[in-house]
Amino acid sequence: AGLKLMGAPVKLTVSQGQPVKLNCSVEGMEEPDIQWVKDGAVVQNLDQLYIPVSEQHWIGFLSLKSVERSDAGRYWCQVEDGGETEISQPVWLTVEGVPFFTVEPKDLAVPPNAPFQLSCEAVGPPEPVTIVWWRGTTKIGGPAPSPSVLNVTGVTQSTMFSCEAHNLKGLASSRTATVHLQALPAAPFNITVTKLSSSNASVAWMPGADGRALLQSCTVQVTQAPGGWEVLAVVVPVPPFTCLLRDLVPATNYSLRVRCANALGPSPYADWVPFQTKGLAPASAPQNLHAIRTDSGLILEWEEVIPEAPLEGPLGPYKLSWVQDNGTQDELTVEGTRANLTGWDPQKDLIVRVCVSNAVGCGPWSQPLVVSSHDRAGQQGPPHSRTSW
């Protein structure tokens, strides 16, 4: 089959938005199925027909209603003939239009009076493309070939920049880039002490506005009274906006405040936030736990625990825990050093322990006291010991 693109030169240049009709002539075939191909891919175009000039001569059409840059490329027509595909000579379609931006100026944030650069690039066809820069409504400098880099020595306020690209088809304007001034960050807020123990405190906060410069770190300052001597200062990288304060003194009033810094410097400190570490749990177990059996039940007695350190705070009440081998168990809270035990089964062995508590919690348990079902009373000792009286 004779296949050729009619009325089309090897290169076809069309303006953007204009229609194009490519004609393909097929001779020597009675029933060709003409396909159009662009850059190797078949072009689906159901409303494009082809016409018979004679029984063995057909013309197919590819109509492009309104060409754009994406239509540019290499076109050819092809037919199947005897199981083989015959292809025509290609035509290169070039779509000309106003410049098309491949790089546009981006928004920036810069320190006051610091130098910076903006980039702009546009392409044709047609070439050449020249670039003109605008600062606000003022043109800066003459036309420069694309691509173009604008060097700015610095700004003292937020300023808008754009570029304009020119070629023989006209001009195109880029997006407007806003160059913002960087500033010191704002103070953090919502500062909370999230976890407290006797010697540690976890702190979390929300960062204030970053001043259009990345926050680099935050400082947590701790004192024992607002405005007093600094006890601790911790510098933490951010994010996350959290900090663990270690080695604090138990049962102590503290205050903390936070500030954050970007490349330009630190924010103001946030307001002081008071907190108090927890005290220590009692360090000693009650001693000499013993039992006295009476007609009405069982009386338990032990020695009073004296605080070893002021940080333990006031001690009391005492907590008594007992269990029997039938599975019965209970806890009892008493203010003094003597307790009357009821509700237990005298026919079963009884194990009793006692501890002293304070605001933090209970101290260590005493040695367990075993009251045997066969005993008239019990004595402090290991769980297996059974003592008669």
């Epitope: 009325g7 159901l46 027909l49 016409i51 013309i59």
Partner: antibody
Amino acid sequence: EVQLVQSGADVKKPGASLTISCQASGYTFTDYWISWVRQKPGKGLEWMGQIRGPASATHYGPSFQGHVTISADRSTATAYLQWRSLEASDTAMYYCVRHQQQTSGGTIPEYYQHWGPGTLVTVSS
Amino acid sequence: SYELTQPPSVSVSPGQTARITCSGDALPKKYAYWYQQKSGQAPVLVIYEDKKRISGIPERFSGSSSGTMATLTISGAQVEDEADYYCYSTSTGGNYMVFGGGTKLTVL
């Protein structure tokens, strides 16, 4: 003169198969593209699909792909629209349409269309 | 799937200009065709490739296209122009055709 003659009206039950035809005369049958168009009672036109004379290449609308088959017999210059299993929603008038471009002396084509009179298909239990 | 949107109805007095619109995302790149269908008859193509009039169609029928909108204009509408009008075009990918929903033109 170009003429498209369509098969007569038909009544079928749901699940039945059916083939309707469109016979062309007055031109070389392979010099055509034929589309099938559906029009439900009181509704608009819907493009079902198309068959191209040379090589009988077919294209279908998304709603009709897999539900109907378009074919042609060159020896009798007839195009067909076939259903394997009809549904009540297939009740409609079906038109065949011949598309043609031809030149009058030059290479600028003029566009013509010929519509068949339509075939009314009723699917009812 | 691709859709073409038309107003359901347009009314004009005899001699006035009727404009029927058709919108579709692919219309900047694909041609629009316009059909006229009178009651009980098969449709007739009146405009092809946006603005080309089929031979035998009165000159008062014209077509245009801008962006995603194609328009059929009937300048000095006649009572006999009362009909349903359908736009028709190619899908975005070019692999199937689509009709608009149709516009009923009333010439009062």
